[in-house]
């Protein structure tokens, strides 16, 4: 439970007071306000929203609210030279062109400045050639094409369906396969749930709807021109040829009406199996090229987008801590959207706004948190997590010394079935305890706790009677805090039923149809799921900022470390002969995990018994908890990914959205059987085991008695 000792506040100012102040009706009102026009990063509309949020956070009672600006590389379509894809005949005449924009939703016909669908950071180009269908363009899809089907993508334009993995990984894979262009499309199999109407009559994607998104492979770098350092007024910027993570081939997204026109003519090889077939009435032939009658026709891309250094604006609000003002708990989510942002990000921004209002109300009544709370409205998340990363780069010295926790607040909903939480193991017990105190919003769980409905609907695969909590991956603004700086991080939102809805994300993701009405009519008419997410996010922040002893349980890290060590050992053991030949041993890692487990257990015992009235000892114990996440950071970073420095977790090299455990060892083992120099490859596995074992042992020692 929260304790209010040492903050000199009246008993009524506890977590209950904070939670009771959160109102669904306010979240609804804020969401409406934030979604009436587009708020694309680098536009006046988004700057005005930043100033509005700054003004309102001041009114709500924060101690200070400042704008932090950076000049970063963004990407935009050419306003007078639109992007499109054509089918051309043997004479070069365009016999079919993809649409230039999405038909606007009802009520939005007169809205200006709706950016047409595009793949941000695509280079310019007009490649033409034969088409190859590459399924989801995952690593395994290209393995299937190249190794099993002997299909060469070199010099071809590939068409890939969205879903399963981050679009930037698709483009990287296509580049490595030698493709000269990429067409991304939304297949109804992934973005049209059966039995639901398309927008505006339901929450499914219409045929003219298109998913926007960046196609960078930044690996945590932030602004492509200033990796590692803030993009401020005196920044030294790389030339565009040296920029981090930019794609080298043109890329463009389309909807399934246009995709149908491209795919229906495909010839060449049949799909290798049913997992390569979507739901369109096309054969899903792989190609290359079109079938018989159309074999002389080619596909041509026309991409004219430009990369421009553009000013972006974060809003940073501060609520100073009464006792430990030099300890920061951060709640952050982005403000920029591709179009209206009905779900992404404004369902999250509206929740943050209401959390700020509630904290402000308590502050006006004389309360202060024990620790400082920082609130952030990040800019340019959609262009590669740029606002959060630049701010963290600028403030890295403060953050690494003072950062207690970061709670992310992007989309509050991606469905309305149950809770979804991804966080550091340090926060497992905090999340469990908090959700046991909150009411479930779910139908059929009236009077029951959120913990109960969540556990029932999303059970842990390992521990009975507990809910699933996932690893942090990336694709959102916690990345720099967790993966680079080693600040304990977590995120929570309401999600779909993954068992029955096997589409990727939510159907209208990053389309013009992601409106206020989508949320109000179809996802959460009473805003009860938004309120629950506000309670979870806000409750976590409250507890992290206000509990006398930090609500971190290091024993939970011990449990997962053992699980991850077992998992990576099992992967390695698929190669028993090579392990023997090259003397590969995991003994050091298992020994380090054992030591961590024992030391964490002893630390937890001391945590129960120490004198909490002694401020020096209290601060010492809290610092050991705060710095535990930091202890998993390797200053040298992961191979070829210097800004992914967490040894236990990193975004998957094959899917930025997914988290991978012991990523250094995992990547060293990946596809090792195909490496040309096995001795070198297994040497790298051994090196990565060494790094992991050392890091776990070093982290364990930070929990030992200090003297």
């Amino acid at each position: 439970k929260s304790s209010n000792e040492a903050t000199n506040i009246t008993p009524k100012h506890n977590m209950k007071a904070f939670l009771d102040e959160l109102k669904a009706e306010n979240i609804k009102k804020f969401l409406y306000n934030f979604t009436q026009i587009p708020h694309l990063a680098g536009t006046e509309q988004n700057f005005q929203l930043a100033k509005q949020i700054q003004s309102q956070w001041k009114e709500f009672g924060l101690d200070s609210v400042e704008l932090a600006h950076y000049d970063v590389l963004l990407s935009y379509p050419n306003k007078t030279h639109p992007n499109y894809i054509s089918i051309i005949n043997e004479d070069g005449n365009e016999i079919f062109n993809t649409s230039l924009f999405e038909p606007p939703p009802p009520g939005y016909e007169n809205v200006s400045d709706i950016v047409p669908p595009f793949s941000a950071f695509s280079p310019q180009g007009m490649p033409e050639g034969d088409l190859v269908y590459v399924n989801y363009a995952r690593t395994e899809d290209f393995f299937k094409l190249e190794r099993d089907m002997k299909i060469n993508c070199s010099g071809k334009i590939v068409i890939a369906r969205y879903g399963k993995v981050f679009r930037g990984n698709k483009v990287k894979n296509a580049q490595l396969a030698g493709a000269k262009g990429v067409i991304l499309y939304s297949d109804p199999a992934d973005y049209f749930a059966p039995g639901v109407k398309s927008y505006p009559d339901g929450w499914n994607l219409p045929g003219g709807g298109v998913q926007r998104g960046n196609i960078l492979n930044l690996n945590g770098a932030g602004d492509p021109l200033t990796p590692g350092y803030p993009a401020n007024e005196y920044a030294y910027r790389r030339g565009i040829a040296e920029a981090v993570g930019l794609p080298s081939i043109p890329v463009h997204p389309i909807g399934y009406y246009d995709a149908q026109k491209l795919l229906e003519k495909m010839g060449g090889s049949a799909p290798p199996d049913s997992s390569w077939r979507g739901s369109l009435k096309v054969p899903y032939n792989v190609g290359p090229g079109f079938t018989g009658n159309f074999s002389t026709q080619k596909v041509k891309m026309h991409i004219h987008s430009t990369n421009e250094v553009t000013r972006i604006y974060n809003v940073i609000g501060t609520l100073r801590g009464a006792v430990e003002p030099d300890r920061y708990v951060i709640l952050g989510g982005h403000r920029d959207s591709w179009v209206f942002g009905g779900i992404d990000p404004q369902s999250g921004a509206a929740v943050v706004h209401e959390i700020v209002r509630s904290f402000g109300t308590l502050k006006k009544e004389g309360w202060r948190p024990r620790r400082t709370i920082l609130f952030a409205s990040w800019d340019a998340e959609e262009f590669g997590l740029l606002g959060s990363t630049e701010w963290a780069e600028e403030n890295s010295r403060l953050l690494q010394e003072r950062g207690v926790a970061y709670i992310n607040a992007d989309s509050s909903i991606e469905g309305n079935y149950t809770l979804r939480v991804d966080c550091t193991p340090l926060m497992y017990s905090l999340v469990h305890n908090l959700t046991k105190e909150l009411k479930s919003p779910d139908e059929g769980f009236e009077g029951k706790s959120l913990y109960e409905s969540w556990t029932k609907k999303s059970p842990s695969p390992e521990f009975s009677g507990m809910p699933r909590i996932s690893k942090l991956g990336s694709g959102n603004d916690f990345e720099v805090f967790f993966q680079r700086l080693g600040i304990a991080s977590g995120r929570a939102r309401y999600t779909k039923n993954w068992e029955t809805n096997k589409f990727s994300g939510y159907p209208l993701y990053h389309s013009v149809y992601e409106t206020y009405e989508l949320v109000e009519k179809f996802y959460d008419p009473m805003f009860k799921y938004h309120l629950t997410v506000a309670q979870v996010r806000g409750g976590m922040v409250f507890e992290l900022a206000n509990s006398i002893v930090l609500p971190f349980d290091c024993r939970d890290y011990a449990v997962v470390l053992r699980k991850y060590a077992d998992k990576i050992y099992s992967i390695s053991m698929k190669h028993p002969q090579e392990m023997k030949t090259y003397s590969v041993s995991f003994d050091s890692l298992f020994s380090a995990v054992k030591n961590f487990t024992e030391i964490a257990s002893k630390f937890s015992e001391r945590l129960q018994d120490f004198d909490k009235s002694n401020p020096i000892v209290l601060r010492m114990m809290n610092d050991q908890l705060m710095f535990l996440e930091r202890a998993f950071i390797d200053p040298l970073g992961l191979p070829d990914r210097p800004f992914y420095r967490h040894v236990i977790y990193a975004p998957s090299s094959h899917n930025k959205y997914a988290g991978e455990s012991f990523p250094g060892i995992y990547d060293a083992l990946f596809d090792i059987e195909s490496k040309v120099d096995p001795s070198k490859a297994w040497g790298e596995v051994k090196r990565q085991i060494y790094v992991a074992a050392f890091t776990v042992q070093a982290a364990a020692e930070t929990l030992s008695e200090v003297a």
Epitope: I37, P38, L40, G42, T43, E44, Q45, N46, F47, H69, D71, L74, Y76, K79, T80, N110, V111, S112, D113, V115, E233, E308, V309, T310, R311
Partner: antibody, heavy 121, light 107 residues
Framework: EVQLVQSGAEVKKPGASVKVSCKAS????????ISWVRQAPGQGLEWMGE????????YYNEKFRGRVTLTADKSTSTAYMELRSLRSDDTAVYYC??????????????WGQGTTVTVSS | DIQMTQSPSSLSASVGDRVTITCRAS??????LNWLQQKPGKAPKRLIY???SLDSGVPSRFSGSRSGTDFTLTISSLQPEDFATYYC?????????FGGGTKVEIK
């Protein structure tokens, strides 16, 4: 408070040049551009061009290209408009106006008080 | 270049009257249109941006609307301080162009 303060009235002979200044205050100069608009006596408004000091980009109305040069001094938060080869029909009030530096903007929100340029032999 | 045809060029009205001024764009400009007010010897002042959004401090009697490429400025109840010349401005594409102006005079 946002302010754009322009230089004083000028009287010039045909063929000469004029340079009008526009000093900005009350906002971050490099977050915005400066547009220039002129208004001949008793006439309407005519856009001449704009400059974005942060990136140094300039955009001109073709009608004035080659005769007008827009510059900016970030250190003093001042924008300049120089018009060369003056003719009698260049007699007008010249205004500077602030415009947001971004992919989409709402055009001119704050205006200078105007500078009268008279071209007469 | 995009032509902006503004009408009427002048009108006489009394205090309390409802006044409507229109601008027609020669091609689609979306909602990228502002309305400006200019008083004699003064600089223009922006009243409305993006077709219908009021600038801060502008009285709510001013409103803007759009139907296709036709744009309307409405003053619901004319006040003495509203007698001025009004211009529309399109900023959808360069060069930005203004309407010819509408002079609102006292009847």
């Amino acid at each position: 408070e946002v302010q754009l303060v322009q230089s004083g009235a000028e009287v010039k002979k045909p063929g000469a040049s004029v340079k009008v200044s526009c000093k900005a205050s009350g906002y971050t100069f490099t977050s915005y551009g400066i547009s220039w608009v002129r208004q001949a006596p008793g006439q309407g408004l005519e856009w001449m061009g704009e400059i974005f000091p942060r990136r140094g980009n300039t955009y001109y109305n073709e009608k004035f290209r080659g005769r007008v040069t827009l510059t900016a001094d970030k250190s003093t938060s001042t924008a300049y408009m120089e018009l060369r080869s003056l003719r009698s029909d260049d007699t007008a009030v010249y205004y500077c106006a602030r415009v947001f530096d971004g992919y989409y903007n709402y055009a001119m929100d704050y205006w200078g008080q105007g500078t009268t340029v008279t071209v007469s032999s | 270049d995009i032509q902006m045809t503004q009408s009427p060029s002048s009108l006489s009205a009394s205090v309390g009257d409802r006044v409507t001024i229109t601008c027609r764009a020669s091609q689609d400009i979306g909602s990228s249109l502002n309305w400006l007010q200019q008083k004699p010897g003064k600089a223009p002042k922006r009243l409305i941006y993006a077709t219908s959004s009021l600038d801060s401090g502008v009285p709510s009697r001013f409103s803007g609307s759009r139907s296709g490429t036709d744009f309307t400025l409405t003053i619901s109840s004319l006040q003495p301080e509203d007698f001025a010349t009004y211009y529309c401005l399109q900023y959808a594409s360069s060069p930005y162009t203004f309407g010819g102006g509408t002079k609102v005079e006292i009847k």
